[in-house]
C-alpha cells in the first residue's frame, strides 16, 4: 500500500482531460495536483468519471481548501456538488448568482436536497436579504420555494421582491405564509391603478384582512371562486351579502356550488336568510328574521 | 387553552445523544413555528432553531447546525430536538415556544407567546 | 448576528417604585423588540411586544418605548410578584437574539 502512494513514473497530471478517467483511485490521489484541479475545474464536468474518481478528486479539493472552497471554485464543481455535505457547504461564501444557478442547475428536476438548500440558505444570507433576482432564480428552478420556508423567512422578504413572485409560486401556500407576504404584496403593488393592482393581488388575497376585502368589494373586481375560497375565513365572515356581491360580481352565482364548504358555509351561517334570499340562489342556513343577532366577539373587545 | 408540554429531565454521558419532545395542544398545530431556547444554569436564553410544520421548513442558529436537529411528527402535534456529541457546555435548560405573530400595517410582528415548561439536560459521567 | 445587551444584570428596587430595564442592541432593528419575563420557577412569560404593545394579561403597570438601538421596559408601581428576570429580545432578523437578563429584587 505504501508504494502506491508515489505518483508512477510519466503518469503526472501536467492538465485536467480525459486521460485521467483510466487512473486508478490511489493514481489520482498521487497524480494530480490539487492546485492545477482547482485553476482547471471547469474541464472535470465534461469528463465521465466515476464517483469514486469524483470522491478522489474532492478529497484533494478538501486538502487544499480546509476553510472552505473560493468561489471560483464553486462556480466550476458541477457534478462533483452531488458530492458535497451540507458541512461542506456551510463554509463556502457564495455572492454570486451565476454560481447559484450553475449548482442549482447540476440538480435540476430533482427534489430539493438538504446541500441545495444549505446552499440557498448561505447565498441568502450572504446577500442579507432575498432580493428580486435570487427569489426569480429560485422560483424558476422551484416553484415552491417561497412556500417551503417558514412564515420568519417570509418576514424578510423585502416588498420590492415580491415582484418576482408568480402566481403559481403561491399554490403551495398555507394561510399563515399568505398572512405575512400579503402586507408586502399590497405596498409592492400600492401604486398601480385599480384593475391592474387587483391581478398582481390576486393570488396574495388568502392573506387579506376583512376592511381590504370591502374595499375591493367597491372596486368591481369581479373575484373568482377559487379567489374566494382561499379567503381567511375570519376575514370573510363580517362581510355582508351586499358586499359579497358586489366583489364576486357575476361569479356569485358559484354560491350556490360552494354552500357547504368553507368560509362560504361560514359565512352563510352569519348572513340573515332574507338578505341571502335577495340573491336568488336558494342558499339556505341564514339567521330566520325576526331573530336578533349578537356579537359575542365585540362584547368581549368591549369589557 | 394553548399548551405545550415537554419531556422530563435527562441524565445523559458525554458523547451520547438526547432526543427532546414538545407536545403542542389547543390550537392549529401547522400553523404555528415552534421555536427552541437554551438556557445555562444561571445564564441568558439563546435562540437555537425553528421547526415549521406546514411547510416542514427548518432553521437553525449556525452555532448549533452541528449540534441540534429538529423534527416533527404531525400525528401527534410534536415537534423533537435532538441533541448528538453531548458536553458539559450542553447541560442546560431547554425551552419549546410558539411563535405568534400577526400583520400590522406593511410588516409582520413576532412574539413567543406560549413556552413549555423546559426540559433540563445533565451532562455528566 | 444582533448582539443584545442588558448592562445592569441585577436591579434591587423597593414596592411601589418605578423601576426602569434597558436594552441596546448592536445595530437598528426598528422597534423588532419584545419583553419577556422569567420567574424564579423558571416559568417564562410574554410581557411586551413589539416595544410598546402590552400583550392580553399584562397588567398596565408594565410598558416599553425606544426606538433604533435603545429600548427600555418600565414597571410603574412595583409589586411583589413582578421579582423575576427580565429579557429583552429582538427578532429584526435570524437568529433571534436575547439580552443576558435584568434580574429584579426587592429591597
Known amino acids: 500500500e505504501v508504494e502506491k502512494t508515489a505518483c508512477p513514473s510519466g503518469k503526472k497530471a501536467r492538465e485536467i482531460d480525459e486521460s485521467l478517467i483510466f487512473y486508478k483511485k490511489w493514481e489520482l490521489e498521487a497524480c494530480v495536483d490539487a492546485a492545477l484541479l482547482a485553476t482547471q475545474m471547469d474541464r472535470v464536468n465534461a469528463i465521465p468519471f466515476t464517483y469514486e474518481q469524483l470522491d478522489v478528486l474532492k478529497h484533494k479539493l478538501d486538502e487544499l481548501y480546509p476553510q472552505g472552497y473560493p468561489e471560483s471554485v464553486i462556480q466550476h464543481l458541477g457534478y462533483l456538488f452531488l458530492k458535497m455535505s451540507p458541512e461542506d457547504i456551510r463554509k463556502w461564501n457564495v455572492t454570486s448568482l451565476e454560481t447559484l444557478k450553475a449548482l442549482l442547475e447540476v440538480n435540476k428536476g430533482h427534489e430539493m436536497s438538504p446541500q441545495v438548500a444549505t446552499l440557498i440558505d448561505r447565498f441568502v444570507k450572504g446577500r442579507g436579504q432575498l432580493d428580486k433576482d435570487t427569489l426569480d432564480t429560485l422560483t424558476a428552478f422551484y416553484p415552491g420555494y417561497l412556500c417551503s420556508l417558514s412564515p420568519e423567512e417570509l418576514s424578510s422578504v423585502p416588498p420590492s421582491s415580491i415582484w418576482a413572485v408568480r402566481p403559481q409560486d403561491l399554490d403551495t401556500c398555507d394561510p399563515r405564509q399568505l398572512d405575512v407576504l400579503y402586507p408586502k404584496a399590497r405596498l409592492a403593488f400600492q401604486n398601480m391603478n385599480g384593475s391592474e393592482y387587483f391581478v398582481k393581488i390576486q393570488s396574495f388575497l388568502g392573506g387579506a384582512p376583512t376592511e381590504d376585502l370591502k374595499a375591493l368589494s367597491q372596486q368591481n373586481v369581479s373575484m373568482d371562486l377559487a379567489t374566494f375560497m382561499k379567503l381567511r375565513t375570519d376575514a370573510v365572515l363580517p362581510l355582508t351579502v351586499a358586499e359579497v356581491q358586489k366583489l364576486l360580481g357575476p361569479h356569485v352565482e358559484g354560491l350556490k356550488a360552494e354552500e357547504r364548504h368553507r368560509p362560504v358555509r361560514d359565512w352563510i351561517l352569519r348572513q340573515r336568510q332574507d338578505d341571502l334570499d335577495t340573491l336568488g340562489l336558494g342558499l339556505q342556513g341564514g339567521i330566520p328574521n325576526g331573530y336578533l343577532v349578537l356579537d359575542l366577539s365585540m362584547q368581549e373587545a368591549l369589557s | 387553552q394553548v399548551q405545550l408540554q415537554q419531556s422530563g429531565a435527562e441524565l445523559v454521558k458525554p458523547g451520547a445523544s438526547v432526543k427532546l419532545s414538545c407536545k403542542a395542544s389547543?390550537?392549529?398545530?401547522?400553523?404555528?413555528?415552534i421555536h427552541w431556547i437554551k438556557q445555562r444554569s444561571g445564564q441568558g436564553l439563546e435562540w437555537i432553531g425553528l421547526f415549521y410544520p406546514g411547510s416542514g421548513s427548518i432553521k437553525y442558529n449556525e452555532k448549533f447546525n452541528d449540534k441540534a436537529t429538529l423534527t416533527a411528527d404531525k400525528s401527534s402535534s410534536t415537534v423533537y430536538m435532538e441533541l448528538s456529541s453531548l458536553t458539559s457546555e450542553d447541560s442546560a435548560v431547554y425551552f419549546c415556544a410558539r411563535h405568534e405573530g400577526h400583520s400590522y400595517g406593511h410588516t409582520y410582528l413576532w412574539f413567543f407567546d406560549v413556552w413549555g415548561a423546559g426540559t433540563t439536560v445533565t451532562v455528566s459521567s | 448576528d444582533i448582539q443584545m445587551t442588558q448592562t445592569t444584570s441585577s436591579l434591587s428596587a423597593s414596592l411601589g417604585d418605578r423601576v426602569t430595564i434597558s436594552c441596546r442592541a448592536s445595530?437598528?432593528?426598528?422597534?423588532?423588540l419584545n419583553w419577556y419575563q422569567q420567574k424564579p420557577d423558571g416559568t417564562v412569560k410574554l410581557l411586551i411586544y413589539?416595544?410598546?404593545r402590552l400583550h392580553s394579561g399584562v397588567p398596565s403597570r408594565f410598558s416599553g418605548s425606544g426606538s433604533g438601538t435603545d429600548y427600555s421596559l418600565t414597571i410603574s408601581n412595583l409589586e411583589p410578584e413582578d421579582i423575576a428576570t427580565y429579557y429583552c429580545?429582538?427578532?429584526?432578523?435570524?437568529?433571534?437574539?436575547f439580552g443576558s437578563g435584568t434580574k429584579l429584587e426587592i429591597r
Open positions: 413589539y416595544t410598546s
Open positions: 389547543g390550537y392549529t398545530f401547522t400553523l404555528y413555528s
Open positions: 445595530q437598528d432593528i426598528s422597534n423588532y
Open positions: 429580545q429582538q427578532y429584526s432578523q435570524l437568529p433571534y437574539t
